[in-house]
């Protein structure tokens, strides 16, 4: 018989139901926006906006200050009062649409859905390690703003993204707002604009540059601005919008818009379609050739990448990469593949593709039929002509007008579909050591911290835990404060360590000490933890072996048994070769001699499953008693592996030494030709790993083995005679004197 250890699924080495409690703050209402500030004097703050309220929190998430931002028309609205005596517009709740830091001052800028989407500026006043907001300044000059031209009307009730850029001594606000006909008719917000904050903080300078969805398209063509960021010489917006001005408006795709961060102009406004797909390793019949498209961006974040991912993406370590979580449609409903996929777009490649697209539009010879695009913003035209014109005039440049690059940038899911049913709603990417980690919030209120690698067929989790008991979706915007990330879910803000919330979800020592160095995990006798959790017994250098099972569960008191031990941390080396004298197995008082590994039995074990086997020959000592006992494996003096060395003892109960007893044999005669079915009856006949019935020294072929009975077919006899019959278990003879009589056939 060839018994094999059962495989242990990789998932059994971790428990994602372990409860972690991370610091949190109850904001008193649905969190609408959140931003963090870290000063250069060790002072820091978290700003959290809810309807009609702005909270200032310290780095410990304790409330430092609160401000009433609404309702507009309410005498208690502190921001409204900064605009002087009202009324300033229709009364109503203030939902915060923009919450950004102006790093130049530094100051916090908040813009809401009320008061024509105007903004308020709050100087930051660091006092000790805390930060307070000065009284708000109203960024609105009544005499400069009209319904048809309102430089101080920034936020759209449908959503606005803002990135602030310092240019010289001035702060420029790169603003992107979702519009519809009703919003556009009210104080004229723009789709994309660049606005300079006036030095006296009385609002934004008039005459700003802007692009807006043309009135005829406002009803059918809506653009959702998902994310904005500034890196290098550009500001980028990420949008979800209809793929075509003329076709079905529900057919959406994702675009990247690029604007110059060094010149407050929109002549070099460029758009590029981002294409993210799930391409399974084995393509199903009928599945699209390039993989299943996931056209709708849900969340995005850009970050420099660690060495390993950089190599996989064929870029240099530390280069900026845009990561996006994409779904199949607005509802993000389940398709054939996973609910969410993650694609990586190196910024350098995006810029190259855009620059090449511009050249393609503007260079000679002209590429016939190439459209400038962006027909929702500008009049249709063919390259190299400016919008709405038939030809270039001598004093205009093709390059000085907005352009949609004709080719899209395609990427495939980094996780190979392994996110499965998970619906990702928040994303923040960090580089820890040389590892790139995606910190993801989910629809059901969990945080997944996963290494970003593409070469594996399973996810490498730093952690996977529930933020609280509410199960509410984690919101899109994530902020970083020191070594923590701030996630919002419902009315709560949670502070999650970048290194993970802890180590208790790793259940085995091996999994614990194989965890990333940055997690600070160590073994505490019987659990995985960080040093502060168990300072006495915490160590990171060795793991005891772990016995999970053995076979067989019984063996003869006399004679040998080939014992197979199952578990983990036996070897640390795939070959399973054991240096002399490192492994000591005892069963009861008796030693079990290690057997060399049978190389023919070595089988590759996929990383998703793991099991280690160790075989030894058990020869009970004369002093060994019958009955139940323990199996003990002690490993010492093993050379260290990559992560730790094996050292220690594991004990498992459940082995029994038994004495086989033969009570009866029948029939006691049979033909000389052999083939008689012998039945041997007794007790403990099946113990151990080997048994033999010998008729005159020749083996009687065993047909059935059970605890109380053996069946075998007699071998042919040399002559008609009475011959000795014996039973050996584990190579030792079972007491008793039996004979079998060969008769004429």
């Amino acid at each position: 018989e060839d018994w094999q250890c059962p495989r242990t699924p990789y998932a059994a080495s971790r428990d994602f139901d372990v409860k972690y409690v991370v610091p949190s703050f109850s904001a008193g209402g649905l969190v609408q926006a959140m931003v963090t500030y870290e000063g250069d004097r060790n002072e820091s703050a978290v700003f959290v906006a809810i309807r009609n309220r702005l909270h200032v929190l310290g780095p410990d998430l304790k409330s430092v200050q609160s401000l009433a931002t609404g309702p507009a028309g309410d005498p208690g609205c502190q921001t409204c009062a900064a605009c002087g005596p009202g009324p300033h517009g229709p009364p109503g709740d203030t939902d915060t649409k923009v919450l950004v830091l102006d790093p130049a001052l530094p100051a916090l800028v908040s813009c809401g859905s009320s008061l024509q989407g105007r903004c308020f500026l709050h100087d930051l006043e660091p006092q000790g390690t805390a930060v307070h907001l000065a009284a708000p300044a109203c960024l609105f000059s009544a005499h400069h703003n009209r319904p048809d031209d309102c430089p101080d009307c920034v936020a759209s009730p449908l959503g606005t993204r803002v990135t602030v850029v310092e240019q010289g001594q001035a702060s420029y606000f790169y603003v992107a707002s979702s519009l519809d006909a009703a919003v556009a008719a009210s104080f004229s917000p723009r789709s994309v604009s660049i606005r300079r904050l006036k030095a006296d903080a009385s609002g934004f300078a008039p005459g700003f540059v802007a692009l807006s969805v043309l009135p005829k398209h406002l009803v059918s063509y809506s653009i959702e601005y998902v994310h904005s960021f500034h890196t290098g010489a550009f500001v980028y917006f990420l949008t979800v919008q209809p793929a075509s001005v003329t076709d079905d408006p529900s057919a959406l795709h994702t675009r990247l818009a690029r604007l110059s961060a060094t010149e407050p102009e929109l002549g070099d406004y460029r758009e590029l379609v981002l294409d993210c797909r799930f391409a399974p390793k084995r393509r199903r019949r009928g599945a699209p050739e390039g993989g299943q498209p996931y056209p709708v961006l849900r969340v995005a974040h850009s970050a420099p990448v660690g060495a390993q991912l950089a190599t996989e993406l064929s870029i240099a370590e530390g280069q900026e990469v845009l990561f996006g979580v994409f779904v199949t449609g607005k509802d993000g409903g389940p398709g054939v593949g996973p609910n969410s996929v993650v694609c990586a777009f190196p910024i350098d490649l995006l810029d190259t593709l855009i620059d090449e697209g511009v050249e393609r539009c503007c260079e000679s010879p002209v590429h016939p039929g190439l459209r400038r695009g962006l027909d929702f913003f500008q009049s249709p035209s063919f390259c190299p002509n400016p919008p709405g014109l038939e030809a270039l005039s001598p004093n205009t440049s093709c390059r000085h007008f907005p352009l949609l690059v004709s080719s899209s940038f395609s990427r495939v899911d980094l996780f190979n579909g392994l996110l499965g049913p998970v619906q990702v709603t928040a994303l923040y990417v960090t580089r820890l050591d040389n590892v790139t980690v995606a910190h993801m919030g989910t629809m059901d209120g969990r945080i997944l911290q996963v290494e970003l690698v593409r070469s594996l067929n399973y996810l490498l989790y730093v952690s996977n835990f529930s933020l609280g008991d509410s199960g509410q979706p984690v919101q899109r915007d994530v902020s970083r404060l020191g070594d923590h990330l701030l996630f919002a879910s419902g009315d709560q803000v949670f502070q999650v360590p970048i290194q993970g919330p802890g180590c208790r979800h790793f259940l085995t020592c091996g999994r614990c000490l194989r965890a990333w160095h940055f997690m600070g995990c160590g073994w505490c006798g019987n659990m995985c933890g960080q040093q502060k959790e168990c300072p006495g017994s915490w160590q990171q250098d060795h793991c005891p072996p772990k016995l999970t099972e053995f076979h067989p569960h019984s063996g003869p008191l006399r004679g040998s048994t080939r014992l197979t031990l199952c578990g983990s941390n036996f070897y640390l080396h795939p070959s399973g070769l054991v240096p002399e004298g490192t492994h000591q197995v005892t069963v009861g008082q008796s030693p079990c001699r290690p057997l060399p590994k049978d190389s023919s039995k070595l089988r590759p074990v996929p990383r998703k499953d793991f099991v280690e086997e160790f075989e030894c020959e058990l020869e009970p000592l004369g002093t060994q008693a019958v009955g139940p006992t323990n199996v003990s494996l002690t490993v010492t003096n093993m050379p260290p592996g990559k992560h730790f060395r094996v050292d220690g003892t594991s004990v498992l109960r459940g082995f029994s030494f038994m004495e086989p007893v033969l009570i009866a044999v029948q029939p006691l005669f049979g033909p000389r030709a052999g083939g008689t079915c012998l039945t041997l009856e007794g007790q403990s006949l099946s113990v151990g790993t080997s048994r033999a019935v010998l008729v005159n020294g020749t083996e009687c072929l065993l047909a059935r083995v059970s605890e109380g009975q053996l069946l075998c077919a007699t071998p042919p006899g040399a002559t008609v005679a009475s011959v000795p019959l014996s039973l050996q278990v584990g190579g030792a003879q079972v007491p008793g004197s039996w004979t079998f009589q060969y008769r004429e056939d």
Partner: antibody, heavy 117, light 108 residues
Framework: QVQLVESGGGLVQPGGSLRLSCAAS????????MSWVRQAPGKGLEWVSY????????YYADSVKGRFTISRDNSKNTLYLQMNSLRAEDTAVYYC??????????WGQGTLVTVSS | DIVLTQSPATLSLSPGERATLSCRAS???????LGWYQQKPGQAPRLLIY???NRATGVPARFSGSGSGTDFTLTISSLEPEDFATYYC?????????FGQGTKVEIK
């Protein structure tokens, strides 16, 4: 220790101008909002003006709006109050005070402004 | 503008007695952006309480502030000789910031 010292007060005719200064020391001036508060002889305290740490926000009492201008020079750790079109009812001791959210926690000793013909 | 009304205008008490000073706002003061100040003749005011109930640095424990919304109270649990002075409340919630007219605590 924190010190606020006002200067620039004196006698001025109605319609005239004065510029008050407040020299700050002993703390990080550019981290604090500052205010001017005045007290007419035998009367209570009257808040006059407020300026945030980086001058982004300035507030004024209705009684001085359009006539007084608050400013600060963080490089000189100094707060100013430019007073134009002075009236007899502006006669008071003018105090500069530090702080906003935690109240006005430090005050100068005041400088007297007398508007009289 | 938020008008702060302090009462009583004058409070005549003996040392060791408890003083209760009231400050009523014409409209709600959000998040308790309200302070109490003490002023003695010929001196600059001194901050006692901020945020309606937080004692400023160095202020003795006999001074306490309470209240929220529109009604605020300053309590001196046991008057010491040096506590006889004029007390002002101030809101710094809504522009323009305003002071109450003051309560004078005098020796009976």
């Amino acid at each position: 220790q924190v010190q606020l010292v006002e200067s620039g007060g004196g006698l001025v005719q109605p319609g005239g101008s004065l510029r008050l200064s407040c020299a700050a020391s002993g703390f990080t001036f550019n981290s604090y909002s500052m205010s001017w508060v005045r007290q007419a002889p035998g009367k209570g305290l009257e808040w006059v003006s407020y300026i945030s740490s980086r001058s982004s926000t300035t507030y004024y009492a209705d009684s001085v709006k359009g006539r007084f201008t608050i400013s600060r020079d963080n490089s000189k750790n100094t707060l100013y109050l430019q007073m134009n079109s002075l009236r007899a009812e502006d006669t008071a001791v003018y105090y500069c005070a530090r702080g906003y959210f935690h109240g006005m926690d430090y005050w100068g000793q005041g400088t007297l402004v007398t508007v009289s013909s | 503008d938020i008008v702060l009304t302090q009462s009583p205008a004058t409070l005549s008490l003996s040392p060791g007695e408890r003083a209760t000073l009231s400050c009523r706002a014409s409209q709600s003061v959000s998040f308790d952006y309200l302070g109490w100040y003490q002023q003695k003749p010929g001196q600059a005011p001194r901050l006692l309480i901020y945020g309606a109930s937080n004692r400023a640095t160095g202020v003795p424990a006999r001074f306490s502030g309470s209240g929220s919304g529109t009604d605020f109270t300053l309590t001196i649990s046991s008057l010491e000789p040096e506590d006889f002075a004029t007390y002002y409340c101030q809101q710094y919630n809504i522009n323009p910031f305003t002071f109450g007219q003051g309560t004078k605590v005098e020796i009976k």
